[in-house]
């Protein structure tokens, strides 16, 4: 169940897709990736207030228990609901190769 | 890739499965669930230090960028990797029914 998409904390404050520009050096990939030199990393960032984009029943339970026991149970967390694949040109022993990664860039987000 | 299971913060401090006892009232279910009266809710709680139980490439990227830009990029978060199903006895218009929920109780955890 994809619950409310209205953010009670104000525009852009709740769980959503953000893009962070990162170099191969930033990612620690410079020794094994040749291209692209820079990656527009899409990731899920933001708060998960009550029922906002709750991924499932577990997220709803977590919200309820966090309200009761905030020191024990954390609030739901903003994480990828799905991913976009990406191809990298990698160094190999014999030269270069292409490799697809299907869990690298967040496509959309939810709270869990 | 299920990366290191050694917690550098000390025993039990990193992302792992916890059990929290909750009543139907705690969960806000008292008006639609008859049984069980109490649920042993298994959930994922704990810190996600560098490469600890990294779920995938995205989690590894997040760790790298959090180290570089801690105010912009949050650390990976401890969430369920899979779930255990649970059956509830529910109230219905005509009486009671059994309903299985497959996304209610965390089975194991990872960082993402």
């Amino acid at each position: 169940a994809r619950n409310g998409d209205h953010c009670p904390l104000g525009p852009g404050r709740c769980c959503r897709l953000h893009t962070v520009r990162a170099s191969l050096e930033d990612l620690g990939w410079a020794d094994w990736v040749l291209s692209p030199r820079e990656v527009q990393v899409t990731m899920c960032i933001g708060a998960c207030p009550s029922q906002f984009r709750a991924a499932n029943m577990h997220a709803q339970i977590k919200t309820s228990l966090h309200r009761l026991k905030p020191d024990t149970v954390p609030a739901p967390c903003c994480v990828p609901a799905s991913y976009n694949p990406m191809v990298l040109i990698q160094k190999t022993d014999t030269g270069v190769s292409l490799q697809t990664y299907d869990d690298l860039l967040a496509k959309d987000c939810h709270c869990i | 890739a299920r990366n290191g299971d050694h917690c550098p913060l000390g025993p039990g401090r990193c992302c792992r499965l916890h059990t929290v006892r909750a009543s139907l009232e705690d969960l806000g279910w008292a008006d639609w669930v008859l049984s069980p009266r109490e649920v042993q809710v298994t959930m994922c709680i704990g810190a996600c230090p560098s490469q600890f139980r990294a779920a995938n490439m995205h989690a590894q990227i997040k760790t790298s960028l959090h180290r570089l830009k801690p105010d912009t990029v949050p650390a990976p978060c401890c969430v369920p990797a899979s779930y255990n199903p649970m059956v509830l006895i529910q109230k219905t218009d005509t009486g009671v029914s059994l309903q299985t929920y497959d996304d209610l109780l965390a089975k194991d955890c990872h960082c993402i």
Epitope: L34, P36, V87 | -
Partner: antibody, heavy 119, light 109 residues
Framework: EVQLVQSGAEVKKPGESLKISCKGS????????IGWVRQMPGKGLEWMGV????????IYSPSFQGQVTISADKSISTAYLQWSSLKASDTAMYYC????????????WGQGTLVTVSS | QSVLTQPPSVSGAPGQRVTISCSGS????????VNWYQQLPGTAPKLLIY???NRPSGVPDRFSGSKSGTSASLAITGLQAEDEADYYC??????????FGGGTKLTVL
């Protein structure tokens, strides 16, 4: 506006060499890979290879490895496909295409260059 | 012989819904994405659907993509005369990198 403009049609004899071009405009040429795709008369699409114009890294389909050479000149935003010795079976339409930002699909295509090899 | 298998031809009347299938294996579609291209007669291919079910801007919502297991499909609703074209699926295969289906000729009756 993103555009890939390819060189004109070529008629060649077997054994001759050839270099066709693909000029990119309307975007940062070095930020996107370029691929080459062959379409033989009445047939489907075949991926030939890819080049990263920034570092000039090239990767070829096993079917085309050693048969063609892909290169790029980033100073003039142009990618190339060349043959050192053409065969009649090289007769086809050749397309250059820009890879989308994830490198998984082709988001813009050139108009194609028809290469005819006949004695 | 293509790594991805498509029917050679499909047809439909204007206004109808048609689907084009693309069958692969666990080394391509089964684990990764599928893209679809439209090639109108005498023109270059054009991206229609990327990453299974995403439409680039400018592509009508009559076109939709889906993937299940090792197969994918392209659906076209409200068929129009200008949809008559060749359609190609494309994915990635660990042995040969980018791979295309053999193409499907869509005829609007």
């Amino acid at each position: 506006e993103v555009q890939l403009v390819q060189s004109g049609a070529e008629v060649k004899k077997p054994g001759e060499s050839l270099k066709i071009s693909c000029k990119g405009s309307g975007y940062s040429f070095t930020s996107y890979w370029i691929g080459w795709v062959r379409q033989m008369p009445g047939k489907g699409l075949e991926w030939m290879g890819v080049i990263d114009p920034d570092g000039s890294y090239t990767i070829y389909s096993p079917s085309f490895q050693g048969q063609v050479t892909i290169s790029a000149d980033k100073s003039i935003s142009t990618a190339y496909l060349q043959w050192s010795s053409l065969k009649a079976s090289d007769t086809a339409m050749y397309y250059c295409a820009r890879y989308g930002r994830y490198g998984t699909y082709f988001d813009y295509w050139g108009q194609g260059t028809l290469v005819t090899v006949s004695s | 012989q293509s790594v991805l298998t498509q029917p050679p031809s499909v047809s439909g009347a204007p206004g109808q819904r048609v689907t084009i299938s693309c069958s692969g294996s666990s080394s391509n579609i089964g684990v990764l994405y599928v893209n679809w291209y439209q090639q109108l007669p005498g023109t270059a291919p054009k991206l229609l659907i990327y990453s299974n079910d995403n439409r680039p801007s400018g592509v009508p919502d009559r076109f939709s993509g889906s993937k299940s297991g090792t197969s994918a499909s392209l659906a076209i609703t409200g068929l129009q005369a200008e949809d008559e074209a060749d359609y190609y699926c494309q994915s990635w295969d660990s042995s040969s990198n980018y791979v295309f289906g053999g193409g499907t000729k869509l005829t609007v009756l």
